[in-house]
Interface confidence: medium
Amino acid sequence: MSKGEELFTGVVPILVELDGDVNGHKFSVSGEGEGDATYGKLTLKFICTTGKLPVPWPTLVTTFSYGVQCFSRYPDHMKQHDFFKSAMPEGYVQERTIFFKDDGNYKTRAEVKFEGDTLVNRIELKGIDFKEDGNILGHKLEYNYNSHNVYIMADKQKNGIKVNFKIRHNIEDGSVQLADHYQQNTPIGDGPVLLPDNHYLSTQSALSKDPNEKRDHMVLLEFVTAAGITHGMDELYK
């Protein structure tokens, strides 16, 4: 077990803070909830603290919760590939470019680390080149979320990882909006981290609303499990 992994044996409180600017529309979001890495489970609620969110909530899911991939459940035989927990408590910087097909792009930078016993994800997001009447600024996405695989590989030069995946957002007219994600994570501290073999995270997310909440908000339940690396040969012969 890595030193960082020991911090995730129980339920951990999570705080998310985002400042965003998309085509000049500035906004802020606060999120709170908890994560349980034993089950790969995240429960979070987000509110837009500046009024109405200028972009659809589903376009921010990867920035919020795929941002705290330290809560992914890594099976016993894959624990030596869990970069995310090994970087804790000092944490990691997570940078992404998200290209929305035939539309604009988000660039995000986040610092994910422990502050006290709370896991904090502080994010800056800049979005440019979006069409005012497109699927994103035109709010044409359905309020739901598909399952995805998130592919992880080591980046030995930067003592971190590179991550690629493609999100499929459902559009109200029945079509799909693709969002290509290019991600890199580098540790904040200078302690040892685990550099993984290639593998993937399998994610399932459910979006809902709080019937008592008047502010613009999103409630998120997510399960994430690491996969893609088989047991070693010695396991097969047990």
Partner: nanobody
Framework: VDQLQESGGGSVQAGEALRLSCVGS????????MAWFRQAPGKEREGVAA????????YYADSVKGRFTITRDNVKNTMYLQMPSLKPEDSAKYYC?????????????????????WGQGTQVTVSS
């Protein structure tokens, strides 16, 4: 927290409004859970409203639900209680409370939670 300081109390007529503020000093990192309590003479202290550290979760006592609004500004380390259309039964000394601990039962019942830090209180008097 070095100090919690309430302000904004006063004497008003029924139907008028007040906004209470509670400023915290002496902390820089994670913001605390916070709550407003009140105590009228000869009565027990009761919870009024509570708010989570990021302002995402809010809780209200049944007696003020739909009337009062709790908010916070984490840049200013300040919590607010907006109290429009006050009633004589809202008369009491209002206290703010704060707690930095995590992973407890705060969200189960924030009014029965054992808060670490308390202010000195501000008096609200509503006459008919």
């Amino acid at each position: 927290v070095d100090q919690l300081q309430e302000s904004g109390g006063g004497s008003v007529q029924a139907g008028e409004a007040l906004r209470l503020s509670c400023v915290g000093s002496g902390y820089t990192s994670i913001n605390p859970y916070m709550a407003w309590f009140r105590q009228a003479p000869g009565k027990e202290r009761e919870g009024v409203a509570a708010i989570s550290s990021g302002g995402v979760y809010t809780y209200y006592a049944d007696s003020v639900k739909g009337r009062f609004t709790i908010t916070r500004d984490n840049v200013k380390n300040t919590m607010y209680l907006q109290m429009p259309s006050l009633k004589p039964e809202d008369s009491a000394k209002y206290y703010c409370a704060a707690d930095f601990r995590r992973g407890g039962n705060w969200n189960v019942d924030p009014f029965r939670y054992d808060y670490q830090h308390w202010g000195q209180g501000t008096q609200v008097t509503v006459s008919s």
